[in-house]
């Protein structure tokens, strides 16, 4: 089953997020991803935990998963590099770098997204954009076209309340509000974009979606700049 969903969002403007990737398993959407360099897509490590012996590929330049689009192209994966400290039992270090079989053909609909290198928290209340092809309602309807939602960043202290995530949100993670509008594990690996810069990656831990007391959790990319640079080097 695909990991993740966007609840309470709307259809994105076609090809307005040229960095958006669909990580696919055996030809079906599995997770979101974000193009961070010509030959590299950033996603979530847990996405591939159940990939078993399947064929992992990356779809770039897509709005619709099923319809032909001139900019769409499916790339094989040369290398999957999970963060060395990612573990099956935790949401920490939930990052994965996928090296495409060749450099992506760039254009208006396919373009890497600059990612945050300055290791500073995004100000609470900042509106950030999250997009994905995850299911759009609790009945499990899967969208064919890319969806997105704007979410305000939530401060870590609130997110760490006992009634919320009870101290699980480390300095390397961030939260966004989840009151009916939310990302969830089917959108795992997708980008949280604030002010046109990649700030977070949707984690793929299991949690209730759309419940304001269980905010969305995102891995802060700035906290992993050294690792990302070392892999991309």
């Amino acid at each position: 089953p695909p990991r993740g969903r966007i609840l309470g969002g709307r259809e994105a403007e076609a090809h307005a997020r040229p960095y958006m990737a669909s990580v696919q398993l055996n030809g079906a959407h599995l997770c979101g991803g974000v193009l961070v360099a010509e030959q590299w897509v950033l996603s979530a490590a847990h996405c591939l935990e159940d990939a078993a012996d399947g064929k992992v590929q990356v779809l770039l330049g897509a709005h619709s998963l099923s319809q032909p689009e001139p900019s769409k192209r499916l790339y094989d994966v040369l290398r999957a590099v999970p963060h060395p400290d990612s573990q099956p039992d935790t949401i920490d270090h939930d990052l994965l770098l996928l090296q495409l079989s060749e450099k992506a053909t760039l254009g208006p609909a396919v373009r890497p997204l600059p990612w945050q290198r300055v290791d500073r928290d995004v100000a609470p209340g900042t509106l950030c954009d999250v997009a994905g092809w995850g299911i759009v309602n609790h009945a499990g309807r899967r969208p064919d076209s890319l969806q997105h939602v704007l979410l305000p960043v939530l401060d870590r202290a609130t997110c760490n309340r006992r009634t919320h995530h009870d101290g699980a949100i480390t300095e390397r993670l961030m939260c966004a509000e989840s009151n009916r509008r939310d990302s969830c594990k089917g959108d795992s690996g997708g980008p949280l974009v604030c002010g046109g810069v990649l700030e977070g990656v949707v984690t793929s831990g299991s949690r209730v979606c759309g419940n304001r007391k269980k905010p969305g959790i995102y891995t802060r990319v700035a906290s992993y700049a050294a690792w990302i640079d070392s892999v991309l080097a």
Partner: antibody, heavy 120, light 112 residues
């Protein structure tokens, strides 16, 4: 519950044949690569064979010690893994484990094993 | 074939002690995809083996954090920070980077 149950072991004479089976349940068998790993009495572990999934053309790999004598196969419709063992030798005497192969890791689920004894 | 050599063969420890097991490969076990498929398994008496560590240093699901893996290239180590009674058994290193896949000969962790 994820489970692997081996069967088909027993006593067989040298140069004889035996077919081991492994019934898988609790997971999408058809998406996983599968392996046989064996352990001779009082000895260590030895990887025997691996078969990949349909999406990887059911590619097979073997340890040098069993190549051309053993054949690994699978029936995805029945969630079954097999090991056909021909021209058996006394050194093939071992506990044979059916083992699931993950994506980030190799042997994450093991069966309880079936014993093969090759003796005259 | 890649030969995996484990030392020591037997490791007598007192409960609460730290234990360290070494595994050396006869050649580099960096896979062509850039990953190092070095794993550690524990086989308790009368049981099937269980995965502890994958890709050198990652703990598998449910494995206590007293277990840690390290190393690179051809030299790898498994450490148990405070040995408990349930840790006793035979530990095997394994390489999955090159076919045929190979296990180390095993290290028996026992009470001193």
């Amino acid at each position: 519950e994820v489970q692997l149950v081996e069967s088909g072991g027993g006593l067989v004479q040298p140069k004889g044949s035996l077919k081991l089976s492994c019934a898988a349940s609790g997971f999408s068998f058809n998406t996983y690569a599968m392996n046989w790993v064996r352990q001779a009495p009082g000895k260590g572990l030895e990887w025997v064979a691996r078969i990949r999934s349909k999406s990887n053309n059911y590619a097979t790999y073997y340890a040098d010690s069993v190549k051309d004598r053993f054949t690994i196969s699978r029936d995805d419709s029945e969630s079954m893994l097999y090991l056909q063992m021909n021209n058996l030798k006394t050194e093939d005497t071992a506990m044979y484990y059916c083992v699931r192969h993950g994506y980030y890791w190799y042997f994450d689920v093991w069966g309880t094993g079936t014993t093969v004894t090759v003796s005259s | 074939d890649v030969l995996m050599t484990q030392t020591p063969l037997s490791l007598p420890v007192s409960l609460g002690d730290q234990a360290s097991i070494s595994c050396r490969s006869s050649q580099s076990i960096v896979h062509s995809d850039g990953n190092t498929y070095l794993e550690w398994y524990l086989q308790k008496p009368g049981q099937s083996p269980k995965l502890l560590i994958y890709r050198v240093s990652n703990r598998f699901s449910g494995v206590p954090d007293r277990f840690s893996g390290s190393g690179s290239g051809t030299d790898f180590t498994l450490k148990i920070s405070r040995v408990e009674a349930e840790d006793l058994g035979v530990y095997y290193c394994f390489q999955g980077s090159h076919v045929p896949y190979t296990f180390g000969g095993g290290t028996k962790l026992e009470i001193k």
